[in-house]
Interface confidence: medium
């Protein structure tokens, strides 16, 4: 048995920062999960991480640069991004593990979201591209 | 380089105690979860305890109750600590890291990483 | 918890030879299974994950398959080194649970 995953297909980041909202076909409450975030076709970048303990206070944390907070419902996570640059415009996609109690379960890829970061600088100089993160 | 290496085994009589440690080069140990396996010279694996990232454990309904799976996170050190120790207890003890999958990016997949294993032997 | 069996217990085989080890679960584990090899004196080494996926840094030769509850190892060439003790291992359900092993040995 698989989770299954639902996102938006398309949100736009006008201010540099969205909200990204996975809704699981599973109830996360009293469980012990791992939800993060990842960006790119091969999902290569791990974007952000909401870990999860019955007993502790929820962990939410990036180990790749992104600017990123969570939020836990009963059947979702939300991922909040700030600070993205326009670069950074990629489909992202949600997963989750559920590792306690049993039986481990994971989800099913989701079709994923494509993130437009739309900076606040409409027009950048091309001799001046700005900041870039990976 | 990936590398584990336990320490910490040892001869000890039934009721005594014994702390395993494994230490860990090349990764971090708190970021990733962390089994305790055992084995029988000449028999199969078994499953000890875990602690995840997040810092929870689990254990085997052999062991509840006897031993404690920790970290040291300044040190990148895994501890067993095993106490009330019963003859069946003898047995090679290795840690392991759960794996990340590069492929699919999950989390929890296999053990990639083991240390070498010490030795525990329980008898008067 | 779940029981894993693992078949034949000894592989009597020729270097070169196909090696087929079979693991069957005592409930289903979806694709939660790994293989693991151990030689003598040393720690498991993980072969393949998610019944199917080859983990870093192993030969071709060795791959996975099934789900459910019927698993099998194939080493479609053995090397020398490949004679060893191989365990399945489950992550469906808790607690984790390796099978009894099967030792594939030089005939």
């Known amino acids: 048995n698989k989770i299954l995953v639902k996102q938006s297909p398309m949100l736009v980041a006008y201010d540099n920062a969205v909200n990204l909202s996975c809704k699981y076909s599973y109830n996360l409450f009293s469980r012990e999960f791992r939800a993060s975030l990842h960006k790119g076709l091969d999902s290569a970048v791990e974007v952000c991480v909401v870990y999860g303990n019955y007993s502790q206070q929820l962990q939410v944390y990036s180990k790749t640069g992104f600017n990123c907070d969570g939020k836990l419902g009963n059947e979702s996570v939300t991922f909040y991004l700030q600070n993205l640059y326009v670069n950074q415009t990629d489909i992202y996609f949600c997963k989750i593990e559920v590792m306690y109690p049993p039986p481990y379960l994971d989800n099913e890829k989701s079709n994923g979201t494509i993130i437009h970061v739309k900076g606040k600088h409409l027009c950048p100089s091309p001799l001046f591209p700005g900041p870039s993160k990976p | 380089e990936v590398q584990l290496v336990e320490s910490g085994g040892g001869l000890v009589q039934p009721g005594g105690s014994l702390r395993l440690s494994c230490a860990a080069s090349?990764?971090?140990?708190?970021?990733?979860?962390m089994s305790w396996f055992r084995q029988v010279p000449g028999k199969g694996l078994e499953w000890v305890s875990v602690?995840?990232?997040?810092?929870?454990?689990h254990y085997a309904d052999s062991v509840k109750g006897r031993f404690t799976i920790s970290r040291h996170n300044s040190e990148n050190t895994l501890f067993l600590q095993m106490n009330s120790l019963r003859t069946e207890d003898t047995a090679v003890y290795y840690c392991a890291r759960h794996g990340i999958s590069g492929t699919t990016s999950y989390y929890y997949y296999g053990m990639d990483v083991w240390g070498q294993g010490t030795t525990v032997t329980v008898s008067s | 918890e779940i029981v894993l069996t693992q078949s034949p217990a000894t592989l009597s085989l020729s270097p070169g030879e196909r090696a087929t080890l079979s693991c069957r679960a005592s409930q289903s584990v979806s694709t939660y299974l790994a293989w693991y090899q151990q030689k003598p004196g040393q720690a498991p080494r993980l072969l393949i994950y998610d019944a199917s996926n080859r983990a870093t840094g192993i030969p071709a030769r060795f791959s996975g398959s099934g789900s459910g509850t019927d698993f099998t190892l194939t080493i479609s060439s053995l090397e020398p080194e490949d004679f060893a003790v191989y365990y399945c291992q489950q992550r469906s359900n808790w607690p984790p649970t390796f099978g009894q092993g099967t030792k594939v040995e030089i005939k």
């Open positions: 090349g990764f971090t140990v708190r970021s990733n979860f």
């Open positions: 602690i995840y990232s997040g810092g929870s454990t």
